[in-house]
Amino acid sequence: EINGSANYEMFIFHNGGVQILCKYPDIVQQFKMQLLKGGQILCDLTKTKGSGNTVSIKSLKFCHSQLSNNSVSFFLYNLDHSHANYYFCNLSIFDPPPFKVTLTGGYLHIYESQLCCQLK
């Protein structure tokens, strides 16, 4: 398992919410991506391929998420100061084999300008 800071912009703010971008290698076909806040699992998304290359997407801990061919985005809404924390993208790779796990993350700073529903 390799742990490190994300070397890309992991947090994208909009409309009082944040998009947390979890990238994965383009060669990866089957995986589980978990979003961790500190040590707690907030969200997860699992992509598997069945016979005939049918793709299955499952979530045990559901968040609004978006899948592309090299990233999973998790969306958190109604930001407040309690959201400030370390967030980690925990990637488990099933395909190509063998199994690999890699963890990347960063600190989410919350500033007044990013909070939801603030009075102008």
Epitope: I2, P25, I27
Partner: antibody, heavy 125, light 110 residues
């Protein structure tokens, strides 16, 4: 010096069993995925089995259910338990190190970079 | 399952000449990072030459070069030395199986 040394090959009858061993030295064995690759006399290379750093195992269709790959990290050793052997299993068997790394959204393949000298398995009646 | 086909089966050249070995995949390889080349001399284990389609492994002379993407990959030896006559294999990292080898190209002295 980084080295892989195979042992355990020999002559065995069809249906028999054999256990190959591979002793690793000069590198952190538990940090690498390992393979067995075989080569029948005068023929090409054939992938046999893979064991990951987490202990997960994968096999070629031709050996599935008959051959078992395992590792003992404390002894820096790789094994191949061979059961229900067939004449078609006759080959030189190589122990091979797989150098790859995953870091965030990068997946690096550095090739099968260390090979043992091979051990010969002959299945014949 | 991707099949790798190497050509020619045998290549007869003289020292000092340029050798071009081909490896063709039965379907497009998603990334060239997964292709490698090996050299094998009689009664020896294979030796890694090139990984990532074009990166020379440690200690490999610069007369060896690799190129290609998609379905077509090439190993070039710019000026053959006597010790270069051997069998060459291309290899792919993949899913099922995790490792695939080409059938090999024998490079022999003309």
């Amino acid at each position: 010096e980084v080295q892989l040394v195979e042992s355990g090959g020999g002559l065995v009858q069809p249906g028999g069993s054999l256990r190959l061993s591979c002793a690793a030295s000069g590198f952190t064995f538990n940090g690498y995925d390992m393979h067995w690759v075989r080569q029948p006399t005068g023929k090409g290379l054939e992938w046999v089995a893979l064991i990951g750093t987490a202990g997960d195992t994968y096999y070629s269709d031709s050996v599935k259910g008959r051959l078992t790959i395992s590792r003992e990290n404390a002894k820096k050793s790789l094994y191949l338990q061979m059961n229900s052997l067939r004449v078609g299993d006759t080959a030189v068997y190589y122990c091979v190190r797989d150098r790859r790394a995953v870091a965030g959204h990068y997946y690096y393949f550095y090739g099968l970079d260390v090979w043992g000298q091979g051990t010969t398995v002959t299945v014949s009646s | 399952e991707i099949v790798l086909t190497q050509s020619p089966g045998t290549l007869s050249l003289s020292p000092g000449e340029r050798a071009t070995l081909s490896c063709r995949a039965s379907q497009s390889v998603s990334t060239s990072r997964t292709l490698a080349w090996y050299q094998q001399k009689p009664d020896q284990a294979p030796r890694l030459l090139i990984y990532g389609a074009s990166t020379r492994a440690t200690g490999i002379p610069d007369r060896f070069s690799g190129s290609g993407s998609g379905t077509d990959f090439t190993l070039t030896i710019s000026r053959l030395e006597p010790e270069d006559f051997a069998v060459y294999y291309c290899q792919l990292f993949g899913s099922s199986p995790p490792i695939t080898f080409g059938q090999g190209t024998r490079l022999e002295i003309k």
